[in-house]
């Protein structure tokens, strides 16, 4: 019995077309992506083929102004429209808190919305009770399949679930669902879920009874042989993993932003078994025209976003400096403003032992893109911000060594002068450089703000404790020479969309004035 | 739990034809194949065919093509397989097997004598 | 017709010894191979498929291995019932294709 699942994940609000590196289309004719894109094929796919399942496997919340303005209404709205199967929670669900996951999701959605390991207790037990799922057992021609779901147990400092939902070990809590599941006589299961590529295999080789493991979080790509676009392969798709009890278990993950459809063909015998497993992420290119009538909806949506870029988000009663005369050379306001509202957006007092779980904000100064001005009335829009942040980049959460900043920091100002973007700008940090030293040799003073402590105050880094630091994916994934941050981070966990974080922060203060204050000397 | 039950034992004269049922259980049957397999007195496996049960699709090995006939009845989740004008070479026990032989049936000895 | 050589046809071996029979096909068969086990008046029962994948309830000391167009079954540590007749079955096109067989009998 031969099952064709068609699958996604970390689309991250891109209900649009896109260009090839995923930020807004410019040339229409090279864009890729986007739901209408996704629906034609998925259609071609269901037409051609009999038993066909179409699953995402979490975070389609936040990450471009579609989400800034509908939270959610948008995915809900889009996936019903494509008739999705099912839905793992990612952690970017939970970005507004429970209510805004339970009230435009959630409520909303006409397929399941699973996870196996939130448990939800208090007053929530009973308000969320049915509206997310362990488990569902679907119908699929003459058979029934098994889809279990599995959210990241790091959602807490990722995410707002708050204090009502308890994330378990995500193996721990899928074996006695996969378990029930064999009591029902059901042989053939998907793990679709959202903890990342090394979670994934762990489960497929962990979990009896789990017969493919569909994931994301990660944004890992698959290919076997020549990979269509830009993105290189972490490894064969399908991934095998061999199982502990001696099962070939196939592993996949579809990139992220909606620019690939998964597709894994899986055959199937009596017993359940894997058989065989082959496929490829098909590229949504242009050569896969739009669907007509969901690009007409899109574009009915659309009118509300153009309407919304223009609204006040909240006033500055000083000049926010982003140009690049300042912020390549020295700190300024623009750069304090950014990483305080990146700071601002990981608050999350999960442990009484510490005022939070991360202090500390790098941010290169070529990714400040316009300053703004503060004689407009004071006023900020979210079209102000997309010039001061044009690139569609998100602020991540990654762990590093003390050893691996300082090499961050000698790096920023290793040729000094020359207005290179990379140049660091920081929050929860003070750096000294003293510049008449050789490069590499430039930092003298590096202290960072403690997390493990009630009245925050300033250490000196320590080369072999591990940091959380909160930066642009743009360095997380090593630009502007920052190789050293991704060869060495120990864990990176991609965040909300930088102008989000930016404009949330501003329409919570409602005023601000950022000062240059001697964070970088 | 999948389960094939075969039909019991047939002793045939040369150039008759013998048909052997397998009844299937445990599984949804329409969704999956039915290979027939078989063995001769003390030699090794010889794949005769399979059937595809939701349509009645079949492929036959070179060998049987012509002789063989697999059909099947989806009220009853039975596969048959016929085999006609009989020789004492057919002299085996048949075997059903499930679509990736990962279950068989008991087996069906067929003799043929005069 | 995929041809599916088998080797050796019989071997003799002792408890604990490990056991090695190898498949080779005339044409790549991707990893479309099962290894049977058949013992004298039964029907044969499917150990391995789809070359290396354990069938549940067998013995972690079967493994199959192999790719293209050589592949093989290994016994880590033969029990007593393990002495049987081993069979490997191509399954990549029709028609499917058995090996010879190989007996193992104690030594």
């Known amino acids: 019995w031969e099952l064709t699942i068609l699958h996604t994940n970390d689309v991250h609000s891109r209900l649009e077309q896109t260009s090839e590196d995923s930020s807004k289309c410019v040339n229409a004719s090279r864009c890729m992506g986007g739901v209408a894109r996704l629906f034609t094929k998925v259609q071609q796919i269901r037409r051609a083929e009999p038993n066909v399942l179409l699953l995402d496997a979490g975070d389609q919340y936040q990450g471009t102004i579609w989400f800034t303005v509908y939270k959610g209404a948008e995915v809900a709205h889009f996936m019903n429209a494509l008739r999705y199967d099912a839905m793992a929670l990612g952690n970017h669900e939970f970005d507004n808190g429970v209510e805004g996951l339970i009230e435009p999701l959630l409520k909303e959605a006409k397929f399941p919305i699973l996870s196996a390991n939130i448990k939800a207790k208090g007053p929530l037990a009973s308000q969320i009770s049915g509206l997310y799922l362990p488990y569902k057992v679907l119908p699929v021609g003459d058979e029934v399949v098994g889809i279990v779901g599995y959210t990241s147990k790091e959602t807490p400092f990722l995410s707002n679930p708050g204090t009502n939902l308890v994330f378990e070990d995500e193996i721990t809590a899928l074996q006695p669902e996969v378990d029930k599941l064999k009591t029902l006589n059901v042989n053939k299961i998907i793990a679709l879920g959202h903890s990342g590529f090394e979670m994934d295999k762990l489960i497929a080789q962990k979990v009896r009874g789990v017969d493919v493991v569909v994931g994301g979080h990660s944004n890992t790509f698959l290919y076997t042989g020549n990979p269509p676009s830009k993105e290189v392969p972490a490894g064969k798709y399908p991934f095998i993993v061999t199982s502990d009890d001696g099962r070939k278990v196939p592993v996949v993950q579809a990139y992220a932003f909606g620019k690939y459809l998964g597709y894994l063909k899986i055959e199937f015998d009596e017993r359940g078994n894997v058989i065989s497993s082959h496929g490829n992420p098909i590229l949504l290119n242009s050569s896969i025209p739009e669907d007509p009538s969901i690009k007409a909806d899109i574009n009915k949506w659309r009118i509300k976003l153009d309407n919304y870029s223009t609204q006040e988000l909240g006033k500055t009663i000083v000049y926010l400096d982003g140009s690049s005369q300042s912020c390549r050379f020295r700190e300024c306001n623009m750069g304090n403003l950014i990483c305080d509202a990146m700071i601002n957006n990981n608050l999350r007092h999960t442990d009484e032992m510490f005022w939070n779980h991360v202090s500390m904000c790098i941010l290169n100064g070529g990714g400040i893109r316009s300053p703004i001005d503060e004689r407009n009335n004071g006023t900020i829009t979210w079209e102000n911000l997309a010039a001061v942040l044009p690139f569609g980049g998100t602020f991540d959460l990654v762990q590093l060594k003390g050893s691996t900043l300082k090499k961050a920091f000698e790096h920023s100002v290793h040729r000094y002068g020359q207005s290179t973007g990379e140049f660091l700008q920081v929050g929860g940090i003070h750096v000294v450089y003293d510049l008449s030293r050789k490069p590499g040799d430039r930092v003298v003073k590096l202290d960072v703000l403690c997390t493990k402590c009630r009245v925050p105050s300033y250490d000196p880094l320590k080369m072999d404790e591990v940091y959380k630091v909160i930066l642009p994916n743009f360095l997380a994934n090593g630009g502007d020479g920052f190789q050293m941050i991704k060869d060495e981070l120990l864990r990176h966990d991609s965040g909300d969309q930088d102008i989000n974080v930016v404009s949330t922060y501003i329409s919570k203060m409602k005023v601000i004035y950022p000062a240059v204050e001697g964070r970088i000397k | 739990e999948v389960q094939l039950v075969q039909s019991g034992a047939e002793v045939k004269k040369p150039g008759a034809s013998v048909k052997v049922s397998c009844k299937a259980s445990?599984?949804?049957?329409?969704?999956?194949?039915m290979n027939w397999v078989m063995q001769a007195p003390g030699q090794g496996l010889e794949w005769i065919g399979r059937i595809y049960h939701n349509n009645g699709d079949t492929f036959y090995s070179q060998k049987f093509k012509g002789r063989a006939t697999l059909t099947v009845d989806k009220s009853t989740s039975t596969v048959y397989m016929e085999l006609s004008s009989l020789r004492s070479e057919d002299t085996a026990v048949y075997y059903c097997a499930t679509s990736y032989v990962g279950d068989w049936g008991q087996g069906t000895t067929v003799t043929v004598s005069s | 017709d995929i041809q599916m050589t088998q080797s050796p046809s019989s071997l003799s071996a002792s408890v604990g010894d490990r056991v090695t029979i190898t498949c080779r096909a005339s044409q790549d068969i991707g990893d479309s191979l099962n290894w049977l086990q058949q013992k004298p008046g039964k029907a044969p029962k499917r150990l391995i498929y789809a070359t290396s994948s354990l069938d549940s309830g067998v013995p972690s000391r079967f493994s199959g291995s192999g790719s293209g167009t050589e592949y093989t079954l290994t016994i880590s540590s033969l029990q007593p019932e393990d002495f049987a007749t081993y069979y490997c079955?191509?399954?990549?096109?029709?028609?499917?294709?058995f090996g010879g067989g190989t007996k193992v009998e104690i030594k």
């Open positions: 079955l191509q399954y990549a096109s029709f028609p499917w294709t």
């Open positions: 445990g599984y949804t049957f329409t969704a999956y194949f």
